[in-house]
């Protein structure tokens, strides 16, 4: 169930998908990957008040009992719901090959 | 990619399961849920450090982008892997109904 | 190490036929493999890869026109409904092409004639 | 998708000269490139891969730079056995993977 998209913090604040750039230096993967040399990353970052963009159930029951417990259960947090692919062009034993990664570019956010 | 299971925090700081003790009344539940009167809420907890329980590429590449740029990306966030499902007895328009919840009590964590 | 096409012939249009390039000397799990043709007396054409685990990847005009898959020793090519715009000398080679692999090797077979006519 | 745009047919030169042919991507396709020399009734011959680095084989009469977008490949003290058509092809990848071959160029030794 994804609740309400109303930011009560103020526009941009809560949780969306944002565009950090990055190079293969940055993230690790000079010595594996070829291409592309920079990816612009789309990752789940903002707040996750009160029912906003709640994932499921579990979402809510946090959101409830972080009011109550803030010390204990911490607030839901901003992650991605689903992934575009992306394909690398990366070196293997032989030589070099496309391989299609499903989990590395967010698509969507939610709060969880 | 489930990585290190090994939390350099020390025993019980890192990304793990926990069971919070709740009521209806704290979950908000009372007005519609007959049964059970208390639910013991597993929920996931604690710190990701570098690599601790990786869900995946996105979560690699958000540790090596928060190492980097720790002011504009988050760590990853410690959230549920899966779930277990809960039967909860609660009011209808008719009468009362069992109903079957896939999503509320987590079962596993990883980082993301 | 060798690469070898088959399966090129006349085909009326419409009718699916499938090209195979038989590889030996090496494994087809360790390389990605592409597929180029070239129309009588015109330039080459890329039409797709299928990589060592066995994920294609087409042009955007040669999706849905043709299907790449392999088994151990053999990737084919299949012309879902072919065209006489399909008319052409279908090459596969091994690699991504635009990167060596590992000793430098660039194998391509000699190609095969598909003629579609009616 | 990515379209490579090759220097137009034909180029001419006398044997010992020097011949240009360029090529440009629609997409920045970073080092992603190869450039292929073909005779009549062969298939593609590899002379440059990653842009810039010869093929095993290959004379150092052959060169290839650029990155992004614009690529060149460079033939020196030309020779009658150069007489070829040349191509150029580029990968790029993002969400998915397109390659495209240029248009060709004919060089002919004079």
């Known amino acids: 169930a994804r609740n309400g998209d109303h930011c009560p913090l103020g526009p941009g604040r809560c949780c969306r998908l944002h565009t950090v750039r990055a190079s293969l230096e940055d993230l690790g993967w000079a010595d594996w990957v070829l291409s592309p040399r920079e990816v612009q990353v789309t990752m789940c970052i903002g707040a996750c008040p009160s029912q906003f963009r709640a994932a499921n159930m579990h979402a809510q029951i946090k959101t409830s009992l972080h009011r109550l417990k803030p010390d204990t259960v911490p607030a839901p947090c901003c992650v991605p719901a689903s992934y575009n692919p992306m394909v690398l062009i990366q070196k293997t034993d032989t030589g070099v090959s496309l391989q299609t990664y499903d989990d590395l570019l967010a698509k969507d956010c939610h709060c969880i | 990619a489930r990585n290190g299971d090994h939390c350099p925090l020390g025993p019980g700081r890192c990304c793990r399961l926990h069971t919070v003790r709740a009521s209806l009344e704290d979950l908000g539940w009372a007005d519609w849920v007959l049964s059970p009167r208390e639910v013991q809420v597993t929920m996931c907890i604690g710190a990701c450090p570098s690599q601790f329980r990786a869900a995946n590429m996105h979560a690699q590449i958000k540790t090596s982008l928060h190492r980097l740029k720790p002011d504009t990306v988050p760590a990853p966030c410690c959230v549920p892997a899966s779930y277990n499902p809960m039967v909860l007895i609660q009011k209808t328009d008719t009468g009362v109904s069992l109903q079957t919840y896939d999503d509320l009590l987590a079962k596993d964590c990883h980082c993301i | 190490q060798q690469l070898k096409e088959s399966g090129g012939r006349l085909v009326t249009p419409g009718t699916p036929l499938t090209l195979t390039c038989t590889v030996s000397?090496?494994?087809?799990?360790?390389?990605?493999m592409t597929w180029v043709r070239q129309v009588p007396g015109k330039g080459l054409e890329w039409i797709g890869i299928?990589?060592?685990?066995?994920n294609t990847y087409y042009a955007s005009w040669a999706k849905g026109r043709f299907t790449i898959s392999k088994t151990s020793t053999t990737v084919d090519l299949k012309i879902t409904s072919p065209t006489t715009e399909d008319t052409a000398t279908y090459f596969c080679?091994?690699?991504?092409?635009?990167?060596?692999?590992?000793?430098?090797?660039?194998?391509w077979g000699p190609g095969t004639l598909v003629t579609v006519s009616s | 998708d990515v379209v490579m745009t090759q220097t137009a047919s034909p180029v001419s030169a006398a044997v010992g000269g020097t011949v240009t042919i360029n090529c440009q991507a629609s997409?920045?396709?970073?080092?992603?490139l190869a450039w292929f020399q073909q005779k009549p009734g062969q298939p593609p011959k590899l002379l440059i891969y990653?842009?810039?680095t010869l093929a095993s084989g290959v004379p150092s009469r052959f060169s290839g730079s650029g990155s992004g977008t614009e690529f060149t490949l460079t033939i020196s003290g030309l020779q009658c056995d150069d007489a070829a058509t040349y191509f150029c092809?580029?990968?790029?990848?993002?969400?998915?993977?397109?390659?495209?071959f240029g248009g060709g160029t004919e060089v002919v030794v004079k």
């Open positions: 080679a091994r690699g991504i092409l635009v990167y060596a692999d590992y000793g430098d090797h660039n194998l």
């Open positions: 000397g090496f494994s087809l799990s360790s390389y990605d």
């Open positions: 299928i990589n060592n685990s066995g």
């Open positions: 997409e920045d396709i970073y080092t992603n």
């Open positions: 990653a842009a810039s």
């Open positions: 092809l580029g990968v790029y990848t993002y969400i998915s993977a397109d390659g495209a």
